[in-house]
């Protein structure tokens, strides 16, 4: 979390950011909230990035004001205008490019005065994995796929009944570049494995963490699986 | 054909004072943010002055900082670079770039006494 | 400033030879790279953006990877067009850098 305070000849106003993540290809959020204000025309909101010459999105006077906005970001912005009055000035981006990834200012006018706040974006690639037991292998072998990474991440296999064990030597990880040549299929197989025992496989970069469990009984096969995201601080 | 044609360059003194011009054709000018490069006799390429698409907005290096100012007129699409108290590490090829990607064809200072 | 280091700063190659020129940033730049070329006595064409995108009416034999702070340019069967000088530049962070260049030349 990064909050920071305006300094000029008007009073300073509080303006708070969160550090987030976004998924390349999907629509992602920079989080920005300051101390709101009774009349909506009194606000401005501008954000802008490191190393880029137009503005990320400008908000003045109730609407949108695009004449100064960067090619880079063309189409892919909006604020949630409805939510500007109350003090919320996060920015929706359209379709995450690995290249938005740096650090942005949120910047607000108004009438109580200035402040802005920089956030650090990173972008990337993350996906849930899903863990399957592999019928077409010869032994026991359960197949972890998760079909969208970048950074390449590591992947960790860990089981309930032997836990601390090193499954390195008992793994085979692979990564298959996807289509549009940025993002990576990770497929990571086990084997030996064992009946009556959850095995977890890990699959983590600078980005996210996720996990895929699964319980092999005699009787039936329970899944689970969860991502999270690594680094998110407010400033 | 998207086009950037620069002009002003010359001979100077050091200490004065110098305004480069560079004509765009083929896009809308007013749309794109726009950058000063220059090239030195070592071929080394130094980003000198950048702007954003309307104009309010610029960035400079410390090296040229308070002696170059960059500035645009949409309505005539042209890009301007004033430099002023001139050194003789400014000697160079200016070229006026749309992004990274778009470079004009460049016009060249000297700054010697 | 983020300095940008590239290399080799020059190579004698043969027609029709694959060659990589590369790029390390003093930090991570997020693909915020373009590659540009100059022949002699001209000025200069931009190749590559965002790290590995071609610009428009670039042949397919020029491509561009990496992230994080290392990147590289690889042009293959070269012709003799493509003997020429090879920058590298940041745009992730103010004031942007170029790598100090590439000179391909004929052997």
């Known amino acids: 979390l990064i909050i920071g305070f305006g300094i000029s000849g008007r009073h300073s106003i509080t303006v708070t950011t969160v550090a987030s993540a976004g998924n390349i290809g999907e629509d992602g959020i920079l989080s920005c909230t300051f101390e709101p204000d009774i009349k909506l025309s009194d606000i401005v909101i501008q954000w802008l990035k490191e190393g880029v010459l137009g503005l990320v999105h400008e908000f003045k006077e109730g609407k949108d004001e695009l004449s100064e906005q960067d090619e880079m970001f063309r189409g892919r912005t909006a604020v949630f205008a409805d939510q500007v009055i109350v003090g919320n000035a996060s920015l929706r981006l359209k379709n995450v490019q690995l290249t938005d990834a740096g650090t942005y200012k949120c910047y607000i006018i108004t009438s109580k005065g200035k402040g802005n706040a920089n956030l650090e974006y990173k972008t990337g690639a993350f996906s849930m994995p899903e863990v399957n037991v592999d019928y077409n292998a010869s032994s026991e072998t359960l197949r972890c796929e998760a079909p969208r990474w970048f950074p390449q991440p590591t992947v960790v296999w860990a089981s309930q009944v032997d836990q601390g064990a090193n499954f390195s030597e008992v793994s085979n990880t692979s990564f298959e570049l996807n289509s549009e040549n940025v993002t990576m299929k990770v497929v990571s197989v086990l084997y030996n494995v064992t009946i009556n025992n959850t095995y977890s496989c890990m699959i983590e970069n600078d980005i996210a963490k996720a996990t895929g469990d699964i319980k092999v009984t005699e009787s039936e096969i329970k899944r689970r699986s969860h991502l999270q995201l690594l680094n998110s601080k407010a400033s | 054909e998207v086009q950037l044609v620069e002009s002003g360059g010359g001979f100077v003194k050091p200490g004065g004072s110098l305004k480069l011009s560079c004509a765009a054709s083929g896009f809308t000018f007013s749309t794109f943010g726009m950058s000063w490069v220059r090239q030195t006799p070592d071929k080394r390429l130094e980003w000198v002055a950048g702007i954003s698409p309307g104009g309010s907005y610029t960035y400079y290096p410390d090296t040229v900082k308070g002696r170059f100012t960059i500035s645009r007129d949409n309505a005539r699409n042209t890009l301007y670079l004033q430099m002023s108290s001139l050194r003789s590490e400014d000697s160079a090829m200016y070229y006026c770039t749309r992004g990274r990607s778009v470079w004009g064809t460049g016009t060249t200072v000297t700054v010697s006494s | 400033d983020i300095l940008m280091t590239q290399s080799p700063s020059s190579m004698s190659v043969s027609l029709g030879d694959t060659v990589s020129i590369t790029c390390h940033a003093s930090q991570d730049i997020s693909s915020n790279i373009g590659w540009l070329q100059q022949k002699p006595g001209k000025s200069f064409k931009g190749l590559i953006y965002h790290g590995t995108t071609l610009e428009d009416g670039i042949p397919s034999r020029f491509s561009g990877s990496g992230s994080g702070a290392d990147y590289s340019l690889t042009i293959s069967s070269l012709e003799s067009e493509d003997f020429a000088d090879y920058y590298c530049?940041?745009?992730?962070?103010?004031?942007?850098?170029f790598g100090g260049g590439t000179k391909l030349e004929i052997k």
């Open positions: 530049v940041q745009s992730a962070q103010f004031p942007w850098t």
